[in-house]
Every structure is written in structure tokens, then in C-alpha cells.
């Protein structure tokens, strides 16, 4: 879902699933600003103190990152200015499942949206001809 209205910006997320041991993406988009320096992205996970990831002033700020995500997260930095706040999660673990919040702040206002991230041992079905 997204929040919109006065002093709020629309943020959109999509429920997604991650394959254990592989890399996953938590999708989040917002109406982009034209410039980069006003954009702050924070990813949070329900039940976890500290941040999953933070991007501000054009670069990552991992000073408040929770240790369970250390070295495993990245945003698509070159795409932030076009409204992509999606999070890349490396080496997905079973414990990564849960409710995440994508929080965005720009010069116009702020907004957030939640997504449910499912993890498991998913595989493509084999097709025999």
C-alpha cells in the first residue's frame, strides 16, 4: 500500500519472495525528485531494532544497520533519482522473512509502504518433453 496526500509522497511496494541462499530484491518505488541530495531511503524490518539499510546524501549510511544485514544489502544507487528505492538482499536466509517498511523522504515530504517478504526453497518446475 502507499500513503499519499499533503506533505506525503506516494510509495509503492510489491510483495515478493526470496530463495534461500540466493540473492533477492525487495521492490519499492516512489515519485522521483529531479535531484539526488534530498532523497532519503530507509528500509526497516518489523521486530528488528536498527535499520536494514539507509541511503542518504547520495550514498549508503550503514551506521545504524542491524548486524543480521551487515554486508548483505544494497540499493540501486544509480536508479534512486528515477524513483527506484528497491533493496537488493544477498544470500537470503529463512529468518529474512517478515514485514519490511520502505520509508522515503524527499524535499516534498515523506511516505512509506510495507511489504511482506517470504523466504523458502523455491524452484522452477522441471519440464520434460
Amino acid at each position: 500500500f502507499g500513503i499519499s496526500g499533503k506533505h506525503f509522497i506516494t510509495v509503492t511496494t510489491f510483495t515478493s519472495a526470496g530463495n534461500i541462499g540466493e540473492d533477492g530484491t525487495l521492490s519499492c518505488t516512489f515519485e522521483p525528485d529531479i535531484k539526488l541530495n534530498g532523497i532519503v531511503i530507509q528500509w526497516l524490518k518489523e521486530g528488528i531494532k536498527g535499520l536494514v539499510h539507509e541511503f542518504k546524501e547520495g550514498k549508503d549510511d550503514l551506521s545504524q544497520q542491524h548486524e543480521m544485514f551487515r554486508g548483505r544489502t544494497a540499493v540501486f544507487a544509480d536508479q534512486v533519482v528515477v524513483g527506484n528505492a528497491s533493496l537488493r538482499l544477498k544470500n537470503v536466509q529463512l529468518t529474512d522473512a517478515g514485514t519490511y517498511t520502505c520509508y522515503i523522504r524527499t524535499s516534498k515530504g515523506k511516505g512509506n509502504a510495507n511489504l511482506e517478504y517470504k523466504t523458502g526453497a523455491f524452484s522452477m518446475p522441471e519440464i520434460n518433453v
Epitope: 515519485e31 522521483p32 525528485d33 535531484k35 541530495n37 547520495g58 544507487a77 533519482v81 528515477v82
Partner: antibody, heavy 116, light 107 residues
């Protein structure tokens, strides 16, 4: 093919007005911010104004603030620049450009000449 | 406002030469820098964005590097079609600003 096509330039007297248009095709116009950039004869590039995809963010260069207005009509895939109180120093080729990480698509430009 | 200072303002080189153009921002712009090529009478063309990412369709002889305040555009082996004017631009903050340009001429 992704294309931007400017129109509306011409010769105008100081103090006059012009409205530039930029018709977009070949991409989802409503998903992109847009810019106007100008280039005076023999000079470098100068950013003029920008507008985000849904018009939520609008910015102007100090040199045109209060005189120029950027707008867009997503239903018509068109970007506009309303230019009032034109001055000799506004004489330039005006380009529209698509906002990405940088300006990834440019129109061919339309020439504005301000002279008496 | 952030000033983008390009150097040199003009440069003479020969086909096959390696050429480097630098751009210095008056304050940190992270990696929010783009490079453009412009030929006479034509619109600029995006070469590099996010300081180092080559735009689709741009030849691999063009490369960008840098972050913070110092940025470089390198052409590894000049081709005849590369003689043009090159501009850097920051999109970190408004007003968006361009360098003054570097005119690359045939020696």
C-alpha cells in the same frame, strides 16, 4: 523509437512571451521527469527548469524564476515552457530532455531569438 | 550553488590518443555526475551517468570515474567521430549545473 520534438521558438521582442512545447513519443512519458536546457550562441549548456513525472517537484534556475513556467500534460505526452518578460540574454537554442540518471534523451532544439 | 569546473577548456589530440578530461565539483556531489558529447548543430548525447556507468550504445572506449568532488572522463583511443565538445553535469542538487565544456580538436 524514443523521441522528443520541440516547437514554438521564434523571434520575439524584449518583454514579449513565447510558449515552447516538447512532444514525446516512444516511451511512457508520465513515468519520467523532464528538463529544459538552453544554449546561447557559442556558449555552453545552461539548465533552465525541471518537472517531475507527476508535477510534484518543480525547479527553476534563478535567471528565469518568476518569468518562466514549466508544466506538462501527461494525457498529451507534452512538456511546456511558458516564457514571459523575455530578455536579450534569453536568446538561445532550447532543448527538452528526459530526466534519468542524467539527461538520457534530448530533442533537436528550438531557437528563441529575443531582439528588437 | 555547486560549480562544476572542467579542464582543460580545449584540447588538441590525434586519432588513437588516450584523452582525459577532468571535472571538479565545488562540493561533494556523491556519484551524481553525467558526461555528454555534443557536436556542432546537434543536441548533446549522454555518454556516462552515475559517474562511471556507460549509457547503452556508447562505445567501450569511453569510461568515467570518480566520486565526491573529482571526476574524470577518459577516451582510451580517440576515433575521428570523437572530436566534439564534452560537458560534465551534476544532478545532486538544484540548480543542476554543467561544466563549461571541453572542446576536443584534431591536432
Amino acid at each position: 523509437e524514443v523521441q522528443l520534438l520541440e516547437s514554438g521558438g521564434g523571434l520575439v521582442q524584449p518583454g514579449g512571451s513565447l510558449r515552447l512545447s516538447c512532444a514525446a513519443s516512444g516511451f511512457t512519458f508520465s513515468s519520467y521527469g523532464m528538463h529544459w536546457v538552453r544554449q546561447a550562441p557559442g556558449k555552453g549548456l545552461e539548465w533552465v527548469a525541471s518537472i517531475s513525472s507527476s508535477s510534484g517537484y518543480i525547479y527553476y534556475a534563478d535567471s528565469v524564476k518568476g518569468r518562466f513556467t514549466i508544466s506538462r500534460d501527461n494525457s498529451k505526452n507534452t512538456l511546456y515552457l511558458q516564457m514571459n518578460s523575455l530578455r536579450a540574454e534569453d536568446t538561445a537554442v532550447y532543448y527538452c530532455a528526459r530526466a534519468s540518471s542524467g539527461m538520457d534523451v534530448w530533442g533537436q532544439g528550438t531557437t528563441v531569438t529575443v531582439s528588437s | 550553488d555547486i560549480q562544476m569546473t572542467q579542464s582543460p577548456s580545449s584540447l588538441s589530440a590525434s586519432v588513437g590518443d588516450r584523452v582525459t578530461i577532468t571535472c571538479r565539483a565545488s562540493q561533494s556531489v556523491s556519484s551524481a555526475v553525467a558526461w555528454y558529447q555534443q557536436k556542432p548543430g546537434k543536441a548533446p548525447k549522454l555518454l556516462i551517468y552515475a559517474a562511471s556507468i556507460r549509457e547503452s550504445g556508447v562505445p567501450s572506449r569511453f569510461s568515467g570515474s570518480g566520486s565526491g568532488t573529482d571526476f574524470t572522463l577518459t577516451i582510451s583511443s580517440l576515433q575521428p567521430e570523437d572530436f566534439a565538445t564534452y560537458y560534465c553535469q551534476q544532478y545532486y542538487s538544484t540548480p543542476l549545473t554543467f561544466g563549461q565544456g571541453t572542446k576536443l580538436e584534431i591536432k
